[in-house]
Amino acid sequence: VPRWRQQWSGPGTTKRFPETVLARCVKYTEIHPEMRHVDCQSVWDAFKGAFISKHPCNITEEDYQPLMKLGTQTVPCNKILLWSRIKDLAHQFTQVQRDMFTLEDTLLGYLADDLTWCGEFNTSKINYQSCPDWRKDCSNNPVSVFWKTVSRRFAEAACDVVHVMLNGSRSKIFDKNSTFGSVEVHNLQPEKVQTLEAWVIHGGREDSRDLCQDPTIKELESIISKRNIQFSCKNIYRPDKFLQCVKNPEDSSCTSEI
């Protein structure tokens, strides 16, 4: 008789999840010499320990503490790029501008990017059928708590000028409920961070509006200013040209506004 299993609203754990995490860890530590000493089996043990045998709606940041510890990574604190609702362009940017880092360029972000996982209370099984959805089921699920925890630590580590890439095509360019708006903004350390510079990425080719005047950007400016951090904003009217100019800054067409 098959055992009764909780049916959640979200997709189940990504197939071959343990193998994927371990393989990603090995690949990352081979490519990044500063993390070469990290023992990927211990990293997997810590990852597994955060959610296996635990109720998938009752996960805490402390559950992930061992994993966070093993994944501790020093990135240049003045070279951090945050993003909200525009992951692909942010990643394309750091692939070209190799001295800047998104969360997914760190070991822990790389391990979990685009993956889903959850377990079941009191069993050592991974649930490949379904996992809790943030809205429909619960917010304290393994995936959401993981990203909240790593995002908090990533923001806490930032210094000097921090950049954030925002999607100008969305109705809320700055969304207080996004990970950036609810976690990262509030964990930038005013004693270390001087300025938050927003890059608002335009979607339409003919869109010449100044999206830095958008009410949600003004809201972001207000939140940041109240935290004694300066705020600046730039429109990126042509993201394709922007990337091209990052690749080839000497190009004559790169002196004009992008």
Epitope: H37, A46, K69, C77, K192
Partner: antibody, heavy 120, light 110 residues
């Protein structure tokens, strides 16, 4: 508090197991690490373990392979050392890390240490 | 491997004076400020003084001050007392949760 035991005078090539015993708290939700200090030298980190359910452990590069950290009960952690050489002569401390993710990376509580001497 | 260089290796101070100990890290510590200071007296376990570069550990007098960020840190002991005679160590926190200690600074109080 923490207390180390098992330090001894041993010959090169020998093995030795040190024990760290807690009183007044259990190891279950703390990182416990081993740190050593050679005579007249500075402190050197060896290994750490965290054991809420399954053991999570990691080591300094130089300690991998020869040293093994284990939790043997909720109040005892051991450090097994093999193929000992004169360079391993040191006072070995166990230490408890500050709890909470904002405080990791520091040792709030140390044992008095146990002396290991490797000599023929 | 990370190297933490403490200077001076030994310092003598009069009671009521000030002592400054520097810790230079070969690589920036995690989070730019993940550095601790310990006081170690002979026959006793080391005692945590400061964490996150400038935060005083519980029960430590405010005469102890920590500063610095990245790879350069300083411990200052103001109004030195005879009880402050000890060896002081800095300790950084690094990639993969690894730790590295400085070589120590002996403080002699005269």
């Amino acid at each position: 508090s923490l207390e180390e035991s098992g330090g001894d005078l041993v010959k090169p090539g020998a093995s030795l197991t040190l024990t760290c015993t807690a009183s007044g708290f259990s190891f279950n939700n703390y990182w416990i690490c081993w740190i050593r200090q050679a005579p007249g030298k500075g402190l050197e980190w060896v290994a750490c373990i965290y054991s809420p359910s399954g053991d999570i452990k990691y080591y300094a590069n130089w300690a991998k392979g020869r040293f093994t950290v284990s939790k043997t009960s909720s109040t005892t952690v051991t450090l097994q050392m093999t193929s000992l050489t004169g360079a391993d002569t040191a006072t070995y401390f166990c230490a408890r890390e500050l709890s909470g993710s904002s405080y990791e990376g520091y040792f709030e509580s140390w044992g008095p240490g146990t002396l290991v001497t490797v000599s023929s | 491997a990370q190297v933490l260089t403490q200077t001076p290796s030994s310092v003598s101070a009069a009671v009521g004076g000030t002592v400054t100990i520097n810790c230079q890290c070969s690589q920036s510590v995690y989070g730019h400020n993940w550095l601790a200071w310990y006081q170690h007296k002979p026959g006793q376990p080391p005692k945590l003084l400061m964490y996150r570069a400038s935060n005083l550990a519980s029960g430590v007098p405010s005469r102890f001050k920590g500063s610095g960020s990245g790879s350069q840190f300083t411990l200052t002991i103001g109004e030195v007392q005879s009880d402050d005679a000890a060896t002081y160590y800095c300790q950084g926190y690094y990639n993969g949760g690894s730790y590295a200690f400085g070589g120590g600074t002996e403080v002699v109080v005269r």
